[in-house]
């Protein structure tokens, strides 16, 4: 198994679970259905992963290739400032918002967008790959 927390850089392990996509040193899950932000978070945590935390502009650009106009929840919230679920601040990109009630973050092919957390959207999970596919 890849060692360390969900948020650490993963070692180069060979495989991802079914329906997960390997990109770089991580596995990504792009949902087909839609849920609110909290339910999306729970879905990821139940699969030993986390809602997508983007580390830099390069990762964001790579992931946007796989996205459409449809928004996907990511692990970003506004708690006295926009912060990722690992506690780090959003500092490499701006996020669009139209209202102070929009306190959860989403992404589409155009960039980051705030939304009311209750809105049902697709979501993206991220995790370390595992050496043994049979573990899933």
């Amino acid at each position: 198994l890849c060692q360390g927390s969900n948020y650490s850089t993963c070692a180069s392990c060979p495989s991802c679970p079914d329906r997960w996509m390997k990109y770089g040193n991580h596995c990504y899950y792009f949902s087909v259905e839609e849920k609110d932000w909290n339910s999306s978070l729970e879905f990821c945590l139940a699969r030993d992963s986390h809602l997508l935390v983007i580390t830099d502009n390069q990762e964001m650009s790579l992931l946007q290739v796989f996205l459409s106009e449809a928004f996907c929840w990511i692990g970003l919230r506004n708690n006295s400032g926009w912060r990722w679920e690992d506690g780090s601040p959003l500092n490499f990109s701006r996020i669009s918002s139209n209202s102070f009630v929009q306190t959860c973050g989403a992404i589409n092919k155009n960039g980051l967008q705030a939304s009311s957390c209750e809105v049902p959207l697709h979501w993206v999970c991220k995790k370390c790959p595992f050496a043994d596919q049979a573990l899933f």
Epitope: D36, S97, F100, Q113, E118, V119
Partner: antibody
């Protein structure tokens, strides 16, 4: 497509109450805030309040808090605003509107013209 | 509450002219949360410009918005007859949501 349907007109007597409806279609009703606005003839827009149908929690403009009550019926995807103790100053068009992720209030009903007259 | 004051209340312009209307807030508004609506006579308002400078879908490129803090403006670079309407600014930075009194644009 998203639609908010409101009755065209309501006629009420001074001192009475009125319950205005806003029937939503084309989206998941419980997932978006519904706002209510008042517009007197030839005047600007006033925000009355909003309600989140998923939990029925709401916010009110203090000016209307004592006379307006916002409710929803999720089974019929309908939002309601009850207005009490009406006077001639309440003769106005009342709009419902829905918020969205990118644009703030992109969907509006056609408005209900409330006429308060003896 | 955050009071929005629009000026002028009424303005008149000839086709092709450039017009600017302003919206001043009694307390600072994040530029993300300042929006403009267009309302034509007898119709519901339509979102026109959101987050200070973003044009809503199908809004002509001759419209633009700018501003920050307590001062915002909507500009039409070359007015057309179809732009005759009342324009309202609105803030979504806190409750209660508030609208400006509107600027009515008449075309000569």
């Amino acid at each position: 497509q998203v639609q908010l349907q409101q009755p065209g007109a309501e006629f009420v007597k001074p001192g009475a109450s009125v319950k205005l409806s806003c029937k939503a279609s084309g989206y998941t009703f419980t997932s978006y805030w519904i706002h209510w606005m008042k517009q007197r003839p030839g005047q600007g827009l006033e925000w009355i309040g909003n309600i989140y149908p998923g939990r029925s929690n709401n916010n009110y403009n203090e000016k209307f808090k004592n006379r307006a009550t916002l409710t929803v019926d999720t089974s019929s995807s309908t939002a309601y605003m009850q207005f009490r103790s009406l006077t001639s100053d309440d003769s106005a068009v009342y709009y419902c509107a829905r918020d969205a992720t990118v644009e703030p209030l992109p969907y509006w009903g056609q408005g209900t013209l409330v006429t308060v007259s003896a | 509450e955050n009071v929005l004051t629009q000026s002028p209340a009424i303005m008149s312009a000839s086709p092709g002219e450039k017009v600017t209307m302003t919206c001043r807030a009694s307390s600072s508004v994040s530029s993300n949360y300042l929006h403009w609506y267009q309302q034509k006579s007898g119709a519901s308002p339509k979102i026109w410009i959101y987050s200070t400078s973003n044009l809503a879908s199908a809004v002509p490129a001759r419209f633009s918005g700018s501003g920050s803090g307590t001062s915002y403006s909507l500009t039409i670079s070359s007015v057309e007859a179809e732009d005759a309407a009342t324009y309202y600014c609105q803030q979504y930075s806190g409750y209660p949501l508030t609208f400006g009194g509107g600027t009515k644009l008449e075309i000569k």
